[in-house]
């Protein structure tokens, strides 16, 4: 009987035509949302004026579908055993799920005077930005949309640059009608530990983000992992969202829809400084901001953002190091809420519900040149919003699951 | 050493432009802008603008707006400064200098407008 | 724009003496100020640099002060070679600014 099972599991996991993995895994039948609460700064003068702490509120959730598009140029190559395919992008705003609309305004860092200052250095350089930014009448602070911070906006100061730079600045800037990837992931024809593993991301086996074994793609995209997971393994799982690859351990046994899933977490150890967990010295890029690689709990990718100070957190810098959010007020961190986490069905080795949860925070430095940011006193990495991305197996798919799969079982 | 070495002394008809070259060595050249100041015989100093040659970002003073032009050349170290539509009152020594606290100085180089 | 009102405008010194000149700025601007020498035929040379910082090779006779939008050179011990025109320049904003130049004489 098992065996029987097993060869079935392993016929049905395989990422090609005809087979259930691939129904879903070209379209996910899963419906996908993407919170989003933005921290509202409350006093910016302050702020600006005596380098005071940052006081935050969260506003949320605003909430987005996602992830409705199916995969484009999905291309099988038998030699390799591998499938290619780009994952389109695009959200759809609902109201329904929302505590407010697209329009609502929020006082945030000033995104393009924030990432100018730290990617021209030059004082020089920074007293040209200093007699634009005063001319477009920008600050250390602004007011946007909800729609603006996310998708775009013509930014007033870039605008006033005389050579060409691109003036739409926006946190998810641009997102619909484009895609990520090209993927090649392994299809598991040939071998099934392997199915769904990333072979390349656009073209290549390492990202040339980060040094050493941090600049490695491993594991799958975490929509699903080779079958029979066991309690020990360690998930590798590779998200463009952070620019890097991370895993998770198993935490708990949950039940979901009357199926029997492994719950696996993202631990702590995996944002902590080297000197906690040695592998993640690469992970540390620079010594300043980060105190000569002590502190923990954000991740520093510029680099994969063309040199714009960009840093991933967990929401409210969980498991953060106190420097981080000493000079915010107004986060309250808690496990339950801010952590990610994947449902996995173990036989399969599919996600069945999941929890991405991440941060996204800016760097702003002092500048002597730059009037706005003159009378800074220290760095400060700025929260502007967290995310929570989740999906849950439909009614309907976990009834279809428990006949198929889990019921043949027990 | 840090050397700048600016071209010779030009006599010039009014309505017409000059330019002026300044060759850099003795340090990376994209490292540092390059500011150009004049001073007109008997006067005082006087800042033209100055160019940042890894970002090519530019700044003018705005007596010179419109009539300045600064370049630079990464491939020769060579920075330049065009003035156009002269008039007699262009008559000055012109300096190239580099950084922001103009710590080496050009020889300068005598423009003279005269009809 | 930052205006910079330096002065005296001409002063006359003996050897050994002791000479002061003042550069105010119509704003503030922090301690970015700059400090020439300037001898007939030559270009100007930098001496101090923003934060009063005496440059490498400079003697100790020069020296600076002022914060904010008050600024003071000082030549100790004045000797024959210090004759020169002396000019201040802000460096803070854009445009950078001179002072209108001080000529220094020794008697």
């Known amino acids: 009987g098992d065996l029987l099972i097993q060869k079935t599991i392993k016929k049905q996991v395989v990422l090609e035509e005809g087979t259930i993995a691939f129904k879903n895994w070209v379209k996910t039948g899963t419906e996908v949302y993407r919170q989003f609460w933005i921290f509202d700064v409350q006093n910016p003068q302050e702020v600006m004026m005596n380098s005071s702490n940052i006081q935050v509120k969260q506003r949320g959730p605003y909430t987005y579908r996602v992830r409705f598009l199916a995969k484009e140029n999905v291309t099988q190559d038998a030699e390799d055993n591998t499938v290619s395919f780009l994952q389109p992008n695009g959200a759809i705003f609902e109201p329904s799920l929302s505590v407010g609309t697209e329009a609502d305004n929020f006082t945030v860092l000033n995104l393009a005077v924030a990432a100018a200052s730290h990617i021209y250095q030059n004082q020089f350089v920074q007293m040209i930005l200093n007699s634009l930014i005063n001319k477009s009448k920008s600050s250390m602070f602004q007011v946007r949309t909800l729609r603006e911070l996310l998708w775009g906006y013509r930014d007033p100061f870039l605008s006033l640059v005389p050579y060409p730079v691109t003036t739409t600045v926006g946190l998810f800037y641009p997102y619909n009608n484009t895609a990520d990837g090209v993927y090649k992931v392994f299809n598991g024809k040939d071998n099934i530990s392997k199915v769904a593993i990333i072979d390349t991301y656009k073209g290549k086996r390492n990202l040339s983000y980060w040094e050493s074994h941090c600049d490695m793609i491993n594991g799958t995209d975490a929509a699903s992992f080779p079958p029979f997971v066991e309690k020990s393994q360690v998930l590798q799982f590779f998200s463009s969202d952070i620019c890097r690859s991370i895993y998770a351990v198993f935490e708990s046994d949950v039940n979901l829809k009357g199926i029997p899933v492994y719950r696996f977490v993202l631990p702590s150890k995996a944002f902590a400084s080297p000197v906690e967990n040695p592998d993640n010295y690469c992970f540390c890029t620079e010594k300043i901001i980060s105190k000569n690689c002590t502190s923990y709990g954000v991740l520093d990718i510029s680099k994969c953002k063309e040199g714009r100070p960009v840093y991933i957190s967990l929401p409210h810098f969980l498991y953060a190091s106190p420097d981080v959010s000493e000079p915010i007020d107004g986060l309250n961190p808690n496990e339950e809420e801010h952590r990610t986490y994947l449902d996995i069905e173990p036989i399969t080795g599919f996600t069945l519900q999941f929890a991405k949860r991440l941060q996204v925070n800016l760097l702003v430095k002092p500048s002597e040149k730059i009037q706005v940011l003159k009378n800074l006193k220290r760095n400060y990495i700025v929260p502007i919003l967290w995310l929570n991305e989740t999906g849950t197996i439909g009614d309907e798919k976990a009834n279809m699951f428990r006949s198929q799969v889990t019921g043949k079982i027990n | 050493q840090v050397q700048l070495v600016q071209s010779g002394a030009e006599v010039k008809k009014p309505g017409s432009s000059v330019k002026v070259s300044c060759k850099a060595s003795?340090?990376?050249?994209?490292?540092?802008?390059m500011q150009w100041v004049r001073q007109a015989p008997g006067q005082g100093l006087e800042w033209m603008g100055g160019?940042?040659?890894?970002?090519?970002?530019?700044a003018y003073a705005q007596k010179f707006q419109g009539r300045v032009t600064l370049t630079a050349d990464k491939s020769t170290s060579t920075a330049y400064m065009e003035l156009s539509s002269l008039r007699s009152e262009d008559t000055a020594v012109y300096y190239c200098?580099?950084?922001?606290?103009?710590?080496?100085w050009g020889q300068g180089t005598l423009v003279t407008v005269s009809s | 724009e930052t205006t910079v009102t330096q002065s005296p405008a001409f002063m006359s010194a003996t050897t050994g003496d002791k000479v002061t000149i003042s550069c105010i700025t119509s704003?503030?601007?922090?301690?970015?100020m700059n400090w020439y020498q300037q001898k007939p035929g030559e270009p100007p040379k930098l001496l101090i640099s923003?934060?009063?910082t005496l440059r490498p090779g400079v003697p100790s006779r020069f020296s600076s002060s002022g914060y904010g939008t008050d600024f003071t050179f000082t030549i100790n011990n004045i000797e024959s070679e210090d004759a020169a025109y002396y000019y201040c320049l802000q460096s803070d904003n854009l445009p950078l600014t001179f002072g209108q130049g001080t000529k220094l004489e020794i008697k």
């Open positions: 200098t580099r950084k922001l606290d103009f710590d080496y």
């Open positions: 923003e934060g009063n």
């Open positions: 160019i940042d040659p890894e970002t090519g970002g530019i």
């Open positions: 704003t503030d601007i922090d301690d970015d």
């Open positions: 003795g340090y990376r050249f994209s490292d540092y802008e």
